[in-house]
Protein backbone atom coordinates (compact mmCIF):
# COMPACT_ATOMS: atom_id res chain seq x y z
CA UNK A 1 0.00 0.00 0.00
CA UNK A 2 1.50 3.32 -1.11
CA UNK A 3 2.14 5.98 1.52
CA UNK A 4 -0.86 8.33 1.62
CA UNK A 5 1.11 11.52 2.31
CA UNK A 6 4.61 11.11 0.82
CA UNK A 7 5.72 14.66 1.74
CA UNK A 8 5.41 13.74 5.42
CA UNK A 9 7.30 10.45 5.13
CA UNK A 10 10.86 11.67 5.54
CA UNK A 11 10.52 12.65 9.17
CA UNK A 12 9.48 11.35 12.55
CA UNK A 13 7.02 13.90 13.93
CA UNK A 14 6.21 14.77 17.53
CA UNK A 15 3.03 15.72 19.34
CA UNK A 16 2.43 16.32 23.03
CA UNK A 17 -0.42 15.80 25.47
CA UNK A 18 0.61 18.57 27.85
CA UNK A 19 -2.07 17.82 30.42
CA UNK A 20 -0.80 14.28 30.97
CA UNK A 21 2.88 14.91 30.19
CA UNK A 22 2.95 12.48 27.28
CA UNK A 23 5.16 12.73 24.20
CA UNK A 24 4.07 10.97 21.00
CA UNK A 25 6.45 10.11 18.17
CA UNK A 26 4.73 9.58 14.82
CA UNK A 27 6.03 8.15 11.57
CA UNK A 28 3.21 7.84 9.10
CA UNK A 29 5.04 5.79 6.48
CA UNK A 30 7.32 3.54 8.46
CA UNK A 31 8.24 2.93 12.06
CA UNK A 32 9.51 5.38 14.68
CA UNK A 33 12.63 3.44 15.54
CA UNK A 34 12.20 3.48 19.31
CA UNK A 35 13.24 0.17 20.81
CA UNK A 36 10.81 0.31 23.73
CA UNK A 37 7.85 0.57 21.32
CA UNK A 38 8.87 -2.38 19.19
CA UNK A 39 10.12 -2.64 15.62
CA UNK A 40 6.86 -1.79 13.82
CA UNK A 41 5.44 1.06 15.90
CA UNK A 42 4.19 4.01 13.84
CA UNK A 43 2.90 5.91 16.88
CA UNK A 44 4.94 5.59 20.05
CA UNK A 45 3.69 7.08 23.30
CA UNK A 46 6.20 8.09 25.96
CA UNK A 47 4.60 8.74 29.34
CA UNK A 48 7.10 10.98 31.11
CA UNK A 49 5.35 10.67 34.47
CA UNK A 50 5.67 6.90 34.64
CA UNK A 51 8.70 6.75 32.33
CA UNK A 52 7.02 4.11 30.23
CA UNK A 53 6.63 3.57 26.49
CA UNK A 54 3.66 2.08 24.66
CA UNK A 55 3.04 1.54 20.98
CA UNK A 56 -0.39 3.01 20.25
CA UNK A 57 -0.29 2.44 16.50
CA UNK A 58 1.31 -0.23 14.36
CA UNK A 59 2.74 0.61 10.92
CA UNK A 60 1.58 -2.75 9.58
CA UNK A 61 -2.00 -2.15 10.73
CA UNK A 62 -2.50 1.09 8.85
CA UNK A 63 -5.68 2.12 7.05
CA UNK A 64 -6.05 5.37 5.15
CA UNK A 65 -8.53 7.58 3.36
CA UNK A 66 -7.81 11.02 1.85
CA UNK A 67 -8.36 12.71 5.17
CA UNK A 68 -7.96 10.06 7.86
CA UNK A 69 -5.12 7.78 8.84
CA UNK A 70 -5.65 5.06 11.42
CA UNK A 71 -3.07 2.84 13.03
CA UNK A 72 -4.41 -0.14 14.94
CA UNK A 73 -2.58 -2.37 17.38
CA UNK A 74 -3.09 -5.87 18.71
CA UNK A 75 -3.31 -4.55 22.27
CA UNK A 76 -6.73 -4.97 23.86
CA UNK A 77 -8.39 -2.19 25.76
CA UNK A 78 -11.53 -2.37 27.80
CA UNK A 79 -13.96 0.34 26.79
CA UNK A 80 -17.37 -0.03 28.47
CA UNK A 81 -17.14 -3.79 28.48
CA UNK A 82 -16.33 -4.18 24.78
CA UNK A 83 -13.13 -5.76 23.59
CA UNK A 84 -11.55 -3.04 21.47
CA UNK A 85 -7.94 -2.59 20.37
CA UNK A 86 -5.75 0.43 21.11
CA UNK A 87 -5.43 2.65 18.05
CA UNK A 88 -4.33 6.09 16.84
CA UNK A 89 -6.44 8.25 14.57
CA UNK A 90 -4.98 11.19 12.63
CA UNK A 91 -7.42 13.54 10.88
CA UNK A 92 -5.81 15.49 8.04
CA UNK A 93 -6.92 18.94 6.90
CA UNK A 94 -5.51 21.15 4.16
CA UNK A 95 -2.97 23.70 5.39
CA UNK A 96 -0.51 26.11 3.78
CA UNK A 97 2.64 24.54 5.26
CA UNK A 98 3.66 21.00 6.23
CA UNK A 99 2.30 21.98 9.62
CA UNK A 100 2.42 19.92 12.79
CA UNK A 101 0.38 17.05 14.17
CA UNK A 102 -1.62 18.30 17.15
CA UNK A 103 -2.76 16.03 19.95
CA UNK A 104 -6.53 16.39 20.38
CA UNK A 105 -7.58 13.91 23.05
CA UNK A 106 -7.17 10.32 24.17
CA UNK A 107 -9.66 7.80 25.44
CA UNK A 108 -8.95 4.42 26.94
CA UNK A 109 -8.65 3.03 23.42
CA UNK A 110 -8.09 5.80 20.88
CA UNK A 111 -5.46 8.53 20.61
CA UNK A 112 -6.74 11.36 18.39
CA UNK A 113 -4.60 13.81 16.43
CA UNK A 114 -5.34 16.57 13.92
CA UNK A 115 -2.91 17.76 11.26
CA UNK A 116 -3.32 20.79 8.98
CA UNK A 117 -0.84 20.27 6.17
CA UNK A 118 -0.22 20.94 2.48
CA UNK A 119 -0.11 17.17 2.05
CA UNK A 120 -3.87 16.99 2.57
CA UNK A 121 -4.91 19.64 0.04
CA UNK A 122 -6.89 18.78 -3.09
CA UNK A 123 -4.66 21.03 -5.20
CA UNK A 124 -0.91 21.55 -5.14
CA UNK A 125 -1.01 25.36 -4.86
CA UNK A 126 0.60 25.46 -1.40
CA UNK A 127 3.19 22.72 -1.93
CA UNK A 128 6.84 23.68 -1.65
CA UNK A 129 9.72 22.27 -3.68
CA UNK A 130 11.34 21.49 -0.36
CA UNK A 131 10.05 21.99 3.16
CA UNK A 132 11.09 20.61 6.53
CA UNK A 133 9.34 20.39 9.94
CA UNK A 134 9.31 23.86 11.45
CA UNK A 135 8.55 23.24 15.11
CA UNK A 136 10.24 21.59 18.06
CA UNK A 137 9.51 20.63 21.66
CA UNK A 138 12.01 21.63 24.32
CA UNK A 139 13.00 19.49 27.30
CA UNK A 140 9.97 20.77 29.22
CA UNK A 141 7.72 19.61 26.35
CA UNK A 142 6.86 23.18 25.41
CA UNK A 143 6.22 23.75 21.74
CA UNK A 144 8.23 26.25 19.70
CA UNK A 145 6.60 26.77 16.33
CA UNK A 146 8.12 28.80 13.48
CA UNK A 147 5.37 27.94 10.97
CA UNK A 148 3.98 31.52 11.16
CA UNK A 149 7.32 32.79 9.80
CA UNK A 150 7.19 30.63 6.67
CA UNK A 151 6.68 32.80 3.58
CA UNK A 152 4.54 31.24 0.87
CA UNK A 153 5.95 33.72 -1.62
CA UNK A 154 8.97 35.97 -1.35
CA UNK A 155 11.72 36.06 1.21
CA UNK A 156 13.33 37.86 4.11
CA UNK A 157 16.34 40.07 3.51
CA UNK A 158 19.21 39.32 5.87
CA UNK A 159 20.83 42.41 7.38
CA UNK A 160 24.40 42.43 6.08
CA UNK A 161 27.02 45.16 5.94
CA UNK A 162 28.20 44.08 2.46
CA UNK A 163 26.78 46.54 -0.11
CA UNK A 164 27.65 44.28 -3.06
CA UNK A 165 25.57 41.28 -2.04
CA UNK A 166 22.07 40.53 -0.77
CA UNK A 167 21.27 37.35 1.13
CA UNK A 168 17.62 36.28 1.04
CA UNK A 169 16.17 33.50 3.17
CA UNK A 170 12.92 31.74 3.82
CA UNK A 171 12.14 29.74 6.94
CA UNK A 172 11.94 25.93 6.65
CA UNK A 173 11.08 25.99 2.96
CA UNK A 174 12.36 27.17 -0.41
CA UNK A 175 11.79 30.67 -1.75
CA UNK A 176 8.91 31.09 -4.20
CA UNK A 177 9.60 34.06 -6.48
CA UNK A 178 6.73 33.59 -8.95
CA UNK A 179 4.77 36.63 -7.76
CA UNK A 180 7.66 38.99 -8.37
CA UNK A 181 8.84 39.08 -11.97
CA UNK A 182 11.09 42.12 -11.81
CA UNK A 183 13.23 42.04 -8.68
CA UNK A 184 16.66 40.56 -7.96
CA UNK A 185 14.89 37.70 -6.23
CA UNK A 186 13.57 36.31 -9.50
CA UNK A 187 17.04 35.10 -10.45
CA UNK A 188 17.21 32.76 -7.45
CA UNK A 189 17.46 29.08 -8.47
CA UNK A 190 14.43 26.87 -7.73
CA UNK A 191 14.62 24.99 -4.46
CA UNK A 192 16.88 27.44 -2.67
CA UNK A 193 15.95 28.61 0.83
CA UNK A 194 19.03 30.83 1.05
CA UNK A 195 19.81 32.82 -2.05
CA UNK A 196 22.85 35.04 -2.45
CA UNK A 197 22.57 37.79 -5.05
CA UNK A 198 25.72 39.45 -6.40
CA UNK A 199 25.10 41.96 -9.15
CA UNK A 200 22.88 40.25 -11.70
CA UNK A 201 23.70 36.73 -10.56
CA UNK A 202 21.94 34.68 -7.93
CA UNK A 203 23.34 31.59 -6.20
CA UNK A 204 21.80 28.81 -4.18
CA UNK A 205 23.73 28.74 -0.91
CA UNK A 206 21.40 26.45 1.00
CA UNK A 207 18.36 24.21 0.84
CA UNK A 208 16.42 22.83 3.79
CA UNK A 209 17.40 19.28 4.70
CA UNK A 210 16.72 18.65 8.37
CA UNK A 211 13.92 19.99 10.54
CA UNK A 212 14.23 22.65 13.21
CA UNK A 213 16.40 21.75 16.20
CA UNK A 214 16.43 23.09 19.74
CA UNK A 215 19.81 24.05 21.24
CA UNK A 216 18.55 25.55 24.47
CA UNK A 217 15.01 26.40 25.33
CA UNK A 218 15.47 29.92 24.01
CA UNK A 219 17.57 29.04 20.93
CA UNK A 220 16.43 27.13 17.86
CA UNK A 221 18.61 26.22 14.90
CA UNK A 222 17.82 25.61 11.25
CA UNK A 223 20.53 24.43 8.84
CA UNK A 224 20.53 24.72 5.07
CA UNK A 225 23.06 23.05 2.78
CA UNK A 226 23.65 23.21 -0.95
CA UNK A 227 22.67 19.78 -2.16
CA UNK A 228 24.12 19.53 -5.63
CA UNK A 229 27.76 18.97 -6.43
CA UNK A 230 29.73 21.66 -8.17
CA UNK A 231 31.41 24.24 -6.00
CA UNK A 232 30.76 27.95 -6.37
CA UNK A 233 33.92 29.69 -7.59
CA UNK A 234 33.91 32.27 -4.80
CA UNK A 235 33.71 29.68 -2.01
CA UNK A 236 37.39 28.61 -2.00
CA UNK A 237 36.49 24.97 -2.56
CA UNK A 238 33.97 24.80 0.28
CA UNK A 239 30.33 23.80 0.01
CA UNK A 240 27.97 26.62 0.97
CA UNK A 241 25.92 26.27 4.14
CA UNK A 242 23.61 28.50 6.15
CA UNK A 243 22.83 28.26 9.86
CA UNK A 244 19.96 30.34 11.21
CA UNK A 245 19.72 30.65 14.98
CA UNK A 246 16.35 31.88 16.21
CA UNK A 247 16.60 33.50 19.62
CA UNK A 248 13.72 34.06 22.01
CA UNK A 249 14.34 37.50 23.57
CA UNK A 250 14.58 37.83 27.32
CA UNK A 251 11.68 40.27 27.42
CA UNK A 252 8.84 41.46 25.19
CA UNK A 253 9.97 43.51 22.20
CA UNK A 254 9.23 44.40 18.59
CA UNK A 255 10.44 41.97 15.96
CA UNK A 256 13.94 42.37 14.53
CA UNK A 257 15.50 41.65 11.17
CA UNK A 258 17.60 38.49 10.67
CA UNK A 259 21.25 39.53 10.96
CA UNK A 260 24.35 38.00 9.41
CA UNK A 261 26.72 37.38 12.33
CA UNK A 262 29.53 35.52 10.55
CA UNK A 263 30.57 34.53 7.08
CA UNK A 264 33.60 32.74 5.73
CA UNK A 265 34.07 30.48 2.72
CA UNK A 266 30.34 30.57 1.96
CA UNK A 267 29.39 29.47 5.49
CA UNK A 268 26.78 31.97 6.61
CA UNK A 269 25.65 32.32 10.21
CA UNK A 270 22.47 34.24 10.83
CA UNK A 271 20.90 35.26 14.12
CA UNK A 272 17.25 36.23 14.28
CA UNK A 273 15.84 37.54 17.54
CA UNK A 274 12.12 36.86 17.37
CA UNK A 275 9.40 35.96 19.83
CA UNK A 276 8.31 33.18 17.48
CA UNK A 277 11.30 31.30 18.90
CA UNK A 278 9.67 31.41 22.35
CA UNK A 279 7.36 28.62 23.45
CA UNK A 280 3.87 28.83 22.04
CA UNK A 281 2.09 29.33 25.37
CA UNK A 282 4.06 32.57 25.75
CA UNK A 283 2.62 33.86 22.48
CA UNK A 284 -0.84 32.40 22.17
CA UNK A 285 -4.17 31.87 23.86
CA UNK A 286 -7.32 30.06 22.82
CA UNK A 287 -9.37 32.76 24.54
CA UNK A 288 -9.56 36.48 23.77
CA UNK A 289 -7.14 37.43 26.50
CA UNK A 290 -3.46 37.01 27.19
CA UNK A 291 -2.35 37.74 30.72
CA UNK A 292 -0.43 36.56 33.71
CA UNK A 293 3.21 35.79 34.41
CA UNK A 294 3.29 33.29 31.56
CA UNK A 295 2.84 35.94 28.88
CA UNK A 296 4.46 39.09 30.32
CA UNK A 297 1.53 41.18 29.03
CA UNK A 298 -2.10 41.99 29.72
CA UNK A 299 -4.40 41.97 26.71
CA UNK A 300 -8.16 41.57 26.84
CA UNK A 301 -10.25 41.81 23.69
CA UNK A 302 -13.43 40.41 25.25
CA UNK A 303 -15.12 43.86 25.35
CA UNK A 304 -15.18 43.68 21.54
CA UNK A 305 -17.80 40.91 21.69
CA UNK A 306 -21.17 42.01 20.32
CA UNK A 307 -24.34 41.04 22.07
CA UNK A 308 -27.96 40.88 21.00
CA UNK A 309 -27.34 39.46 17.54
CA UNK A 310 -25.53 42.48 16.13
CA UNK A 311 -22.22 42.14 14.27
CA UNK A 312 -19.41 44.30 12.99
CA UNK A 313 -19.66 44.78 9.22
CA UNK A 314 -16.65 45.17 6.95
CA UNK A 315 -16.91 45.98 3.24
CA UNK A 316 -14.86 43.81 0.90
CA UNK A 317 -15.81 44.97 -2.60
CA UNK A 318 -17.71 41.90 -3.86
CA UNK A 319 -18.45 40.67 -0.35
CA UNK A 320 -19.66 41.89 2.99
CA UNK A 321 -18.03 40.40 6.05
CA UNK A 322 -19.93 40.08 9.30
CA UNK A 323 -17.71 39.63 12.34
CA UNK A 324 -18.54 38.67 15.88
CA UNK A 325 -15.31 38.14 17.80
CA UNK A 326 -14.62 36.85 21.29
CA UNK A 327 -18.00 35.27 21.79
CA UNK A 328 -20.28 32.48 20.69
CA UNK A 329 -23.16 34.50 19.31
CA UNK A 330 -24.46 33.20 15.99
CA UNK A 331 -24.19 35.69 13.13
CA UNK A 332 -27.64 35.99 11.57
CA UNK A 333 -26.47 35.57 7.97
CA UNK A 334 -24.34 32.56 8.87
CA UNK A 335 -27.05 30.78 10.81
CA UNK A 336 -25.94 27.51 12.43
CA UNK A 337 -22.44 27.74 10.94
CA UNK A 338 -20.86 28.75 14.28
CA UNK A 339 -19.02 31.47 12.36
CA UNK A 340 -16.99 34.24 13.95
CA UNK A 341 -16.48 35.69 10.49
CA UNK A 342 -19.19 35.35 7.84
CA UNK A 343 -18.69 36.16 4.15
CA UNK A 344 -21.78 37.16 2.16
CA UNK A 345 -21.75 37.84 -1.58
CA UNK A 346 -23.27 41.26 -2.30
CA UNK A 347 -24.78 40.24 -5.63
CA UNK A 348 -26.31 37.05 -4.22
CA UNK A 349 -26.89 37.11 -0.46
CA UNK A 350 -27.75 33.41 -0.47
CA UNK A 351 -24.06 32.73 -1.07
CA UNK A 352 -22.81 32.61 2.49
CA UNK A 353 -19.53 31.16 3.74
CA UNK A 354 -18.05 30.80 7.20
CA UNK A 355 -14.60 32.39 7.05
CA UNK A 356 -13.58 31.05 10.48
CA UNK A 357 -15.47 29.60 13.42
CA UNK A 358 -15.63 30.91 16.96
CA UNK A 359 -14.49 27.67 18.55
CA UNK A 360 -11.39 27.67 16.27
CA UNK A 361 -9.84 30.79 17.75
CA UNK A 362 -6.24 31.77 18.43
CA UNK A 363 -5.07 35.07 19.90
CA UNK A 364 -1.37 35.69 19.29
CA UNK A 365 0.94 38.47 20.44
CA UNK A 366 4.38 38.13 18.91
CA UNK A 367 7.07 40.57 17.78
CA UNK A 368 4.75 43.46 18.60
CA UNK A 369 1.91 42.20 16.40
CA UNK A 370 -1.44 41.39 18.00
CA UNK A 371 -3.44 39.00 15.85
CA UNK A 372 -6.72 37.18 16.28
CA UNK A 373 -7.12 34.17 13.99
CA UNK A 374 -10.28 32.25 13.21
CA UNK A 375 -9.84 29.05 11.21
CA UNK A 376 -11.85 25.98 10.23
CA UNK A 377 -14.33 27.80 8.00
CA UNK A 378 -16.02 26.50 4.87
CA UNK A 379 -13.75 24.77 2.36
CA UNK A 380 -12.41 26.40 -0.78
CA UNK A 381 -11.78 24.40 -3.96
CA UNK A 382 -8.21 23.65 -2.83
CA UNK A 383 -9.59 21.90 0.24
CA UNK A 384 -8.29 24.71 2.46
CA UNK A 385 -10.80 25.76 5.09
CA UNK A 386 -11.39 29.50 4.98
CA UNK A 387 -9.76 31.46 7.77
CA UNK A 388 -9.59 35.07 8.93
CA UNK A 389 -6.61 36.96 10.31
CA UNK A 390 -7.37 40.16 12.21
CA UNK A 391 -4.39 42.43 12.89
CA UNK A 392 -5.12 44.71 15.83
CA UNK A 393 -3.57 48.10 16.40
CA UNK A 394 -3.70 50.21 19.54
CA UNK A 395 -5.75 53.37 19.07
CA UNK A 396 -6.76 55.14 22.26
CA UNK A 397 -9.06 57.47 20.35
CA UNK A 398 -10.91 54.80 18.34
CA UNK A 399 -14.56 55.49 17.63
CA UNK A 400 -17.50 53.31 18.61
CA UNK A 401 -16.78 53.84 22.35
CA UNK A 402 -13.14 52.86 21.88
CA UNK A 403 -14.04 49.60 20.19
CA UNK A 404 -13.28 50.75 16.67
CA UNK A 405 -14.29 48.67 13.70
CA UNK A 406 -12.62 46.01 11.52
CA UNK A 407 -11.46 46.98 8.02
CA UNK A 408 -11.11 44.30 5.36
CA UNK A 409 -7.64 44.51 3.78
CA UNK A 410 -7.72 41.66 1.29
CA UNK A 411 -7.73 37.95 0.59
CA UNK A 412 -4.95 35.52 -0.27
CA UNK A 413 -5.83 31.92 -1.13
CA UNK A 414 -8.95 31.80 1.07
CA UNK A 415 -7.35 33.61 4.01
CA UNK A 416 -9.11 36.90 4.75
CA UNK A 417 -7.19 39.77 6.31
CA UNK A 418 -8.54 42.61 8.45
CA UNK A 419 -7.02 45.45 10.43
CA UNK A 420 -8.77 46.75 13.51
CA UNK A 421 -7.84 49.91 15.40
CA UNK A 422 -9.18 49.79 18.93
CA UNK A 423 -8.25 50.93 22.43
CA UNK A 424 -8.58 47.31 23.59
CA UNK A 425 -5.47 46.41 21.59
CA UNK A 426 -3.31 48.67 23.74
CA UNK A 427 -0.95 46.22 25.40
CA UNK A 428 0.13 46.51 29.03
CA UNK A 429 3.61 45.07 29.53
CA UNK A 430 4.98 43.26 32.59
CA UNK A 431 8.72 42.89 32.91
CA UNK A 432 10.25 39.41 32.67
CA UNK A 433 9.65 35.83 31.64
Amino acid sequence: QAAPFPELCSYTWEAVDTKNNVLYKINICGSVDIVQCGPSSAVCMHDLKTRTYHSVGDSVLRSATRSLLEFNTTVSCDQQGTNHRVQSSIAFLCGKTLGTPEFVTATECVHYFEWRTTAACKKDIFKANKEVPCYVFDEELRKHDLNPLIKLSGAYLVDDSDPDTSLFINVCRDIDTLRDPGSQLRACPPGTAACLVRGHQAFDVGQPRDGLKVVRKDRLVLSYVREEAGKLDFCDGHSPAVTITFVCPSERREGTIPKLTAKSNCRYEIEWITEYACHRDYLESKTCSLSGEQQDVSIDLTPLAQSGGSSYISDGKEYLFYLNVCGETEIQFCNKKQAAVCQVKKSDTSQVKAAGRYHNQTLRYSDGDLTLIYFGGDECSSGFQRMSVINFRCNKTAGNDGKGTPVFTGEVDCTYFFTWDTEYACVHHHHHH
Epitope: K151, L157, S166, Q184, L185, R186, V412
Partner: nanobody, 123 residues
Protein backbone atom coordinates in the same frame (compact mmCIF):
# COMPACT_ATOMS: atom_id res chain seq x y z
CA UNK B 1 2.51 41.05 -12.03
CA UNK B 2 1.36 44.36 -10.55
CA UNK B 3 0.82 47.57 -12.52
CA UNK B 4 1.34 50.81 -10.61
CA UNK B 5 0.26 54.35 -11.52
CA UNK B 6 1.32 57.34 -9.41
CA UNK B 7 -0.44 60.70 -9.24
CA UNK B 8 -0.54 63.81 -7.09
CA UNK B 9 2.81 65.41 -7.91
CA UNK B 10 3.21 69.09 -8.72
CA UNK B 11 4.76 72.38 -7.73
CA UNK B 12 4.53 73.37 -4.08
CA UNK B 13 6.11 76.07 -1.91
CA UNK B 14 8.52 75.21 0.91
CA UNK B 15 6.58 74.30 4.04
CA UNK B 16 3.64 73.12 1.93
CA UNK B 17 2.01 69.72 1.62
CA UNK B 18 1.21 67.19 -1.10
CA UNK B 19 -0.44 63.80 -1.11
CA UNK B 20 0.81 61.25 -3.64
CA UNK B 21 -1.34 58.30 -4.65
CA UNK B 22 -0.36 55.02 -6.22
CA UNK B 23 -3.10 52.89 -7.76
CA UNK B 24 -2.27 49.19 -8.08
CA UNK B 25 -3.88 46.67 -10.39
CA UNK B 26 -3.07 43.13 -11.52
CA UNK B 27 -2.04 40.38 -9.17
CA UNK B 28 -3.11 40.11 -5.56
CA UNK B 29 -2.62 43.47 -3.87
CA UNK B 30 -2.37 41.84 -0.50
CA UNK B 31 0.81 39.81 -0.96
CA UNK B 32 3.23 42.69 -1.38
CA UNK B 33 5.23 45.12 0.68
CA UNK B 34 4.95 48.63 -0.71
CA UNK B 35 7.50 51.40 -0.95
CA UNK B 36 7.95 54.96 -2.08
CA UNK B 37 11.30 55.95 -3.58
CA UNK B 38 12.56 59.17 -5.11
CA UNK B 39 15.19 60.22 -7.59
CA UNK B 40 16.52 63.75 -7.79
CA UNK B 41 18.25 64.92 -10.99
CA UNK B 42 21.78 63.46 -11.21
CA UNK B 43 21.30 61.36 -8.07
CA UNK B 44 20.59 57.69 -7.38
CA UNK B 45 17.13 56.45 -6.56
CA UNK B 46 16.67 56.52 -2.76
CA UNK B 47 14.27 54.93 -0.29
CA UNK B 48 11.59 57.18 1.23
CA UNK B 49 9.05 54.98 3.04
CA UNK B 50 7.65 51.45 3.13
CA UNK B 51 4.65 49.62 4.54
CA UNK B 52 4.41 45.89 5.22
CA UNK B 53 1.26 44.31 3.84
CA UNK B 54 0.73 41.83 6.64
CA UNK B 55 0.73 44.17 9.61
CA UNK B 56 0.75 47.68 8.09
CA UNK B 57 4.04 48.36 9.91
CA UNK B 58 5.91 51.30 8.41
CA UNK B 59 9.50 52.44 8.02
CA UNK B 60 10.93 55.76 6.85
CA UNK B 61 14.18 57.26 5.67
CA UNK B 62 15.71 59.48 8.38
CA UNK B 63 15.40 62.54 6.12
CA UNK B 64 11.58 62.31 5.99
CA UNK B 65 10.73 60.93 9.45
CA UNK B 66 8.04 63.00 11.16
CA UNK B 67 7.16 64.80 7.91
CA UNK B 68 5.99 62.03 5.57
CA UNK B 69 3.38 59.32 6.22
CA UNK B 70 2.83 56.21 4.14
CA UNK B 71 -0.60 54.54 4.27
CA UNK B 72 -2.81 52.31 2.19
CA UNK B 73 -6.45 51.86 1.35
CA UNK B 74 -6.90 48.20 0.55
CA UNK B 75 -10.48 48.67 -0.61
CA UNK B 76 -9.16 50.96 -3.36
CA UNK B 77 -5.88 49.08 -3.94
CA UNK B 78 -4.09 52.38 -3.37
CA UNK B 79 -0.95 53.42 -1.51
CA UNK B 80 -0.52 57.03 -0.33
CA UNK B 81 2.38 59.24 0.66
CA UNK B 82 1.33 62.28 2.68
CA UNK B 83 4.16 64.82 2.51
CA UNK B 84 4.14 67.74 4.95
CA UNK B 85 6.67 70.51 5.70
CA UNK B 86 8.19 70.08 2.26
CA UNK B 87 11.72 71.35 1.61
CA UNK B 88 13.55 72.21 -1.62
CA UNK B 89 15.71 69.08 -1.15
CA UNK B 90 12.55 66.96 -1.44
CA UNK B 91 12.36 67.89 -5.12
CA UNK B 92 12.49 64.64 -7.12
CA UNK B 93 10.53 62.16 -9.18
CA UNK B 94 8.66 59.94 -6.72
CA UNK B 95 8.10 56.28 -7.55
CA UNK B 96 5.80 53.71 -6.02
CA UNK B 97 7.04 50.08 -5.94
CA UNK B 98 6.04 46.61 -4.77
CA UNK B 99 8.19 43.84 -3.32
CA UNK B 100 7.77 40.32 -1.97
CA UNK B 101 10.87 40.76 0.22
CA UNK B 102 10.36 41.57 3.89
CA UNK B 103 12.62 44.03 5.76
CA UNK B 104 14.10 45.62 2.63
CA UNK B 105 14.60 49.24 1.60
CA UNK B 106 16.81 48.38 -1.38
CA UNK B 107 15.25 49.44 -4.71
CA UNK B 108 16.66 46.39 -6.50
CA UNK B 109 14.48 44.17 -4.29
CA UNK B 110 11.33 45.81 -5.63
CA UNK B 111 10.09 44.06 -8.75
CA UNK B 112 7.20 46.27 -9.87
CA UNK B 113 7.48 50.03 -10.43
CA UNK B 114 5.31 52.92 -11.51
CA UNK B 115 6.35 55.57 -14.02
CA UNK B 116 6.85 58.21 -11.33
CA UNK B 117 5.35 61.59 -10.50
CA UNK B 118 7.37 64.80 -10.29
CA UNK B 119 7.39 66.82 -7.07
CA UNK B 120 8.97 70.29 -7.21
CA UNK B 121 9.45 72.32 -4.03
CA UNK B 122 10.29 75.89 -4.86
CA UNK B 123 9.28 79.41 -3.99
Amino acid sequence: DVQLVESGGGLVQPGGSLRLSCAASGRTFNTYNWGWFRQAPGKEREFVAAIRWSSSKTSYADSVKGRFTISRDNAKNTIYLQMNSLRPEDTAVYYCAASIVDFTTNPSHFGSWGQGTLVTVSS
